[in-house]
């Protein structure tokens, strides 16, 4: 549906509030150095800009295009050159190359100091003093550190940010009722950009008909009772959004959202028994509730798959016809039977009978070739379910901290060239899977497992992207999508990695350790355990775990001690001393 | 699981020596810290050393530093705690210990397995 003038109806649709809102995460996502009072300056003169074209369709300007607008607005900020370098050049090119080069610009670890949270009374000050510059500033911080945030999804998170301060600042203890839902709000946060980053990763670099394979496994996991076309149908619809999303555009995005949520409450009937309490709500939380709804329950009776997928002798006819529709009718009726596999599980259960097929139906007996494709799918099952018994098993075992350490191990000595920041904010990620993932029942333990692992595998992609430094790590994060997570789990130690020289400097600690938070402190450890795995990539785990307890018993005895900094200047060349006698270092 | 004995207490005057030892089997003895504690008569129990998997790093009490040096032989599988200028105030039971998996290196909570102790009276 042609619209004189796209910006006007964006405006028209999503109202000022939200049209504000959106305009400034997109500025925020691009730009990410820019200050807050530049981006603000920037989207007020699109929105004055946008009334006018409200006011008539037809006024100068208002028929161009909306990456027409914004790119030319983001290319007046002055300090664009000694700012963002070679981005700048992006302002030579022309729409839509202009905006491709600025998406290829975002940065997904960009250098900007820590969020530092203020003391509980100085932030409900700051809200009370001014709201919706409190709100614009939260929407900035976020949009800016994490480039693919899901924009809508943004909305609901500043929505819910704002009632827990409108609440807390009146509350008797503000400090005991907001900070717990701040932590919450952060926790959240940061797990939705992980997701959403895994969306945008799988239709930048697979394609839309990855992305549209992921989303038919899904969708047909939570929907099992909807048919095939109505599945089929909120795919495309899906994709649509998550496309424009990812492309930046964020108004396109958040306007389809909106009528993809109107369309799926509209026909629950034919969708799915859990939407009704969904559906009652307002349309931010709406949207997110139907994002997050459990699945249906699997209807009565489904027949056996083999019937049309094997046993049919029209399999190679059905799929010659319409090899996509025709796999993707074959993922569908698979996952639908299937909510305790993992979507990465389906997608590679699919390509192997893509694969059969291709190979098959080209044989001079069809049937005989393809008839026993089921019993491909066996080892294919038990990889990950091994996996994911042996990994609990290992972190029940352990608990979340030390199960921790043993993947930083374990991943440390399969790429050891990865930044060690990097390797921790894995690693960590990694370990939360055991009390994310091991508490379910046998049934919703893979799903939870698996697929979060492919969400924080594609994070370790997507910063090693940027600064390549180990080819395995590139061949496991390029060659498939749903075979990363077996890609690194097979990875063994790297034989030709020369260990690193070793730095006095990395293993120097001072008595601000004592004062960190217990995380900020793990983090200091485990940082301290990729650089001694770096330093001695054959050190055993024994070795490792003992001179960790070494490195525990130093800290703990410093932190007592009265002169706390000299006890860590000697104390420590003592420890390094002592370490490097051990494992020679 | 793990045994631990200790030996080399006794009798002696202030001023005097002892050395204990404390012989360990069981688990891989050389990839645990050791500790010793103490406890004197109606007290607390009382971190006295700790002596690193390697024998590399030593920590001790402040009231013993300078008069006490713990030492390990994993080939052996025992380690050492060599006493020195003994006080009235050191007479207590001494036990050994091997480090657990968590808790405080300077804590009994943090030691999994023990020793039946050996007694330690300096006279004056």
């Known amino acids: 549906d042609a619209h004189k003038s796209e910006v006007a109806h964006r405006f028209k649709d999503l109202g000022e509030e939200n049209f504000k809102a959106l305009v400034l995460i997109a500025f925020a996502q691009y730009l990410q150095q820019c200050p807050f009072e530049d981006h603000v300056k920037l989207v007020n003169e699109v929105t004055e800009f946008a009334k006018t074209c409200v006011a008539d369709e037809s006024a100068e300007n208002c028929d161009k295009s909306l990456h027409t607008l914004f790119g030319d607005k983001l290319c007046t900020v002055a300090t664009l050159r000694e700012t963002y370098g070679e981005m700048a050049d992006c302002c030579a090119k022309q729409e839509p190359e202009r905006n491709e080069c600025f998406l290829q610009h975002k940065d997904d670890n960009p250098n900007l100091p820590r969020l530092v949270r203020p003391e509980v009374d100085v932030m409900c000050t700051a809200f009370h003093d001014n709201e919706e510059t409190f709100l614009k500033k939260y929407l900035y911080e976020i949009a800016r550190r994490h480039p693919y945030f899901y924009a809508p999804e943004l909305l609901f998170f500043a929505k819910r940010y704002k009632a827990a301060f409108t609440e807390c600042c009146q509350a008797a203890d503000k400090a005991a009722c907001l900070l717990p839902k701040l932590d919450e709000l952060r926790d959240e946060g940061k797990a939705s950009s992980a997701k959403q980053r895994l969306k945008c990763a799988s239709l930048q670099k697979f394609g839309e008909r990855a992305f549209k394979a992921w989303a038919v496994a899904r969708l047909s996991q939570r929907f099992p009772k909807a048919e095939f076309a109505e599945v089929s149908k909120l795919v495309t619809d899906l994709t649509k959004v998550h496309t424009e999303c990812c492309h930046g555009d964020l108004l396109e995005c958040a306007d389809d959202r909106a009528d993809l949520a109107k369309y799926i409450c509209e026909n629950q009937d034919s969708i799915s028994s859990k939407l009704k309490e969904c559906c009652e709500k307002p349309l931010l939380e709406k949207s997110h509730c139907i994002a997050e709804v459990e699945n249906d329950e699997m209807p009565a009776d489904l027949p056996s798959l083999a019937a049309d997928f094997v046993e049919s002798k029209d399999v190679c006819k059905n799929y010659a016809e319409a090899k996509d529709v025709f796999l993707g009718m074959f993922l569908y009726e698979y996952a639908r039977r299937h909510p305790d596999y993992s979507v990465v599980l389906l997608l590679r259960l699919a390509k192997t009978y893509e694969t059969t097929l291709e190979k098959c139906c080209a044989a001079a007996d069809p049937h005989e070739c393809y008839a026993k494709v089921f019993d491909e799918f066996k080892p294919l099952v038990e990889e990950p379910q091994n996996l994911i018994k042996q990994n609990c098993e290992l972190f029940e075992q352990l608990g979340e901290y030390k199960f921790q350490n043993a993947l930083l191990v374990r991943y440390t000595k399969k790429v050891p060239q990865v930044s060690t920041p990097t390797l921790v904010e894995v690693s960590r990620n990694l370990g939360k899977v055991g009390s994310k993932c091991c508490k379910h029942p046998e049934a919703k333990r893979m799903p939870c497992a698996e697929d979060y692992l492919s969400v924080v595998l594609n994070q370790l992609c997507v910063l090693h992207e940027k600064t390549p430094v180990s080819d395995r790590v590139t061949k496991c994060c390029t060659e498939s999508l749903v075979n990363r997570r077996p890609c690194f789990s097979a990875l063994e130690v790297d034989e030709t990695y020369v260990p690193k020289e070793f730095n006095a400097e990395t293993f120097t600690f001072h008595a601000d350790i004592c004062t960190l938070s217990e995380k900020e402190r793990q983090i200091k450890k485990q940082t301290a355990l990729v650089e001694l795995v770096k330093h001695k990539p054959k050190a055993t785990k024994e070795q490792l775990k003992a001179v960790m307890d070494d490195f525990a018993a130093f800290v703990e005895k410093c932190c007592k001690a009265d002169d706390k900094e000299t006890c860590f200047a000697e104390e420590g060349k003592k420890l390094v001393a002592a370490s490097q006698a051990a494992l020679g270092l | 699981q793990v045994q631990l004995v200790e030996s080399g207490g006794g009798l002696v005057q202030a001023g005097d020596s002892l050395r204990l030892s404390c012989a360990a089997s069981?688990?891989?003895?050389?990839?645990?810290?050791m500790g010793w504690f103490r406890q004197a008569p109606g007290k607390e129990l009382e971190f006295v050393a700790r002596i690193n998997w390697s024998g590399t790093l030593t920590y001790y009490a402040d009231s013993v530093k300078g008069r006490f040096t713990a030492s390990r032989d994993n080939a052996k599988n025992t380690v050492y705690l060599q006493m020195n200028s003994l006080k009235p105030e050191d007479t207590a039971v001494y036990y050994c210990?091997?480090?657990?998996?968590?808790?405080?290196?300077?804590?009994?909570?943090?030691?999994?397995?023990w020793g039946q102790g050996t007694q330690v009276t300096v006279s004056s």
């Open positions: 069981g688990r891989t003895f050389s990839d645990y810290a």
């Open positions: 210990a091997q480090r657990g998996d968590s808790g405080s290196n300077y804590d009994p909570s943090g030691y999994r397995y």
